[in-house]
């Protein structure tokens, strides 16, 4: 027993005075507390606790159950123990089947022993199966067995606590060893959508995916720059032993303008955090919005192909589109196709391909298109390059000479006089009168030019070309005539064509 | 008339290449998406790819994202399928298909008559 000096409490003192007491079973346990301060004895085994206020711990016929330690306690809150076995040979294990361990920690299998001379007091795998070759352990017949490093792998070991007595090998009741995973990585977090666009009053409704080893990962949906408690429900599965999955579904009912912004799943454990978040775009009504992909102003040559495209944007997803000319709707050679195949994707490409065209097809192309809440158009003016074409070539009666000529862009008129039979008609004229003439075709169509000059400037037999030229090509027409006596007579104008 | 030939089938190596094309006549060529169509042995019709007219636009199937691509040169009025990484799941009959004007990339009006590409080592 302990000695104290004078003036100091001092610790109870126990008969019999030895640590460890063997008694055999049906036998009786006596055991005295001396104390002037005594208060109680405390018996422990498992989990189990026993009081006792009197100084003498009687117990007539020991069981095994009474195996275990026995404290006594004084005022002063020393204590004394002794640790008494009760040998049983039907009953060699107290035992608490119950088994959890984390994993890289030490879990301990609670078999102690009613008897401490047995020997290769062990563990042993269920039905002759060997343990796993790193699983090590420490045996201590007091307390039972204890794990060293659990590893995730040993999740579901099936063991028992083993001794030899009298040569023979006698195991305990079964134990099955649950692991609890510990964390090696953040979280893993995924939201149903990247963003999310929708008009007000419809319902918002966003679901992140939390995947980790076990339940005990923290989840939560916040809003960013925001401390308000979101509404969320959550539904979660264990697929497998370590592989733990939970959905929380963060709800609107009604979204307003003012709640659009950043949402964010956050997830903790104890390895660290991962989030994701969403943005939501509330609008107030649906919208339209074109950008051409050309000039909306184009020149094509004539029998040349052109396409018109355009981007637009719409919310929500369009619901007509079509391409207009003169107040009919293009049946044909046009397309109108998403921009990508992303489930929030908005925009969306039309392409209209004007092939051959002819001089008579300039003018507006509009491209029309609605959804549920607005309509939208965009308008390209296509004009279409031609080569000047001579309308009309004659000598009116005031003796001037007139020719007139269609094309686009704008012909310019030129004259030249050619004396004599020469082919090369050089010598310019100045007209003298030109006019650009209003077109009774579309304001796309053909620009037309009329210029005149003088023939009583002419006073020699010989030829006038008129020659109309735009940046497409030239066409030219001739006026023959000779003179008899005093007379100009007009000889038939004809054209040349020059491409 | 509206005709449609495919070529360039023919047997390649799992992990080759092929490429094949669609000579196009008896419509202008430029104002049409186009697609291209394949049909495994003993199976239904699998959507491929398909290019908008100006080629402006392309969209693939999941089961060949990343390995094939569509093209088309409209001045020679071909359509072109260059297949990469081949598998023996890609081992089909491709068809070139003409689209119709509007909104549905899924609808066709003529068809060729298709070629054979094996995959097999």
């Known amino acids: 027993q302990p000695s104290v000096s004078p003036g100091e409490p001092s610790p109870p003192s126990i008969h019999p005075g030895k640590s460890d007491l063997i008694v055999r079973v049906g036998d009786e346990i006596r055991l005295l507390c001396t104390d002037p301060g005594f208060v109680k004895w405390t018996f422990e085994i498992l989990d189990e606790t026993n009081e006792n206020k009197q100084n003498e711990w009687i117990t007539e016929k020991a069981e095994a159950t009474n195996t275990g330690k026995y404290t006594c306690t004084n005022k002063h809150g020393l204590s004394n123990s002794i640790y008494v076995f009760v040998r049983d040979p039907a009953k060699l294990f107290l035992v608490d089947r119950s088994l959890y361990g984390k994993e890289d920690n030490d879990t301990l299998v609670r078999c102690p022993l009613t008897d401490p001379e047995v020997t290769n007091y062990s563990l042993k795998g269920c039905q002759g199966k060997p343990l796993p070759k790193d699983l090590r352990f420490i045996p201590d017949p007091k307390a039972g067995i204890m794990i060293k490093s659990v590893k995730r792998a040993y999740h579901r070991l099936c063991l028992h606590c083993s001794v030899d007595q009298e040569g023979k090998s006698v195991l305990s009741e079964k134990f099955i060893l649950k692991v609890r995973p510990a964390f090696k990585a953040v979280p893993v977090v995924s939201v149903s959508k990247a963003s999310y666009l929708l008009r007000e009053g419809e319902e918002f409704t966003v679901t992140c995916t939390i995947k980790d080893v076990s339940s005990s990962v923290y989840s939560t949906w916040k809003r960013e720059n925001s401390q308000t408690k979101l509404q969320e429900k959550y539904n979660s599965w264990h697929h497998g032993d370590f592989n733990y999955e939970r959905q929380a579904t963060l709800t609107i009912s009604s979204a307003r303008v003012n709640d659009s912004g950043v949402f964010m799943c956050y997830a903790n454990n104890t390895f660290g955090s991962a989030n994701v978040t969403t943005t939501l775009e509330v609008v107030d009504k649906g919208f339209i919005n074109i950008f051409p992909m050309i000039n909306t102003t184009v020149f094509v040559n004539d029998g040349e192909n052109v396409d018109l495209i355009v981007e637009y944007e719409a919310f929500p997803k369009p619901e007509h589109q079509q391409w207009i000319y003169m107040n009919r709707t293009f049946t044909d050679k046009w397309e109108d196709y998403p921009k990508s195949e992303n489930e929030s994707n908005i925009r969306y490409v039309s392409e209209l391909h004007l092939t051959r065209l002819k001089g008579t097809e300039g003018g507006t192309y509009t491209f029309l298109v609605s959804n549920s809440d607005v309509n939208a158009a965009i308008a390209f003016n296509v004009y279409v390059n031609t080569k000047p074409e001579i309308l009309t070539y004659d000598r009116l009666v005031n003796g001037m000479l007139q020719c007139v000529a269609a094309g686009f862009p704008e012909p310019t008129i030129d004259w030249y006089f050619c004396p004599g039979t020469e082919q090369r008609c050089s010598a310019s004229v100045l007209p003298v009168d030109v006019q650009t003439l209003n077109s009774s075709g579309p304001p796309f169509g053909k620009l037309v030019v009329q210029s005149s000059i003088d023939s009583s400037a002419f006073k020699h037999n010989g030829t006038v070309e008129c020659k109309a030229y735009n940046d497409v090509g030239k066409t030219s027409a001739y006026f023959n005539f000779a003179f008899k006596g005093n007379n100009k007579e007009q000889i038939h104008p004809h054209t040349l064509f020059t491409p | 008339e509206v005709q449609l030939l495919e070529s360039g089938g023919g047997l390649v190596q799992p992990g080759g290449s092929r490429r094949l094309s669609c000579a196009a006549s008896g419509f202008t060529f430029s104002g049409y998406g186009m697609s291209w169509v394949r049909q495994a042995p003993g199976k239904g019709l699998e959507w491929v790819s398909w290019i908008s007219g100006t080629g402006y636009g392309t969209y693939y199937a999941d089961s060949v994202k990343g390995r094939f691509t569509i093209s088309r040169d409209n001045s020679k009025n071909t359509l072109y399928l260059q297949m990469n990484s081949l598998r023996a799941e890609d081992t089909a009959v491709y068809y070139c298909?003409?689209?119709?004007?509007?909104?549905?990339?899924?609808?066709?009006?003529?068809w060729g008559q298709g070629t054979l590409v094996t995959v097999s080592s």
């Open positions: 298909a003409k689209g119709v004007p509007g909104n549905n990339r899924a609808l066709f009006d003529y």
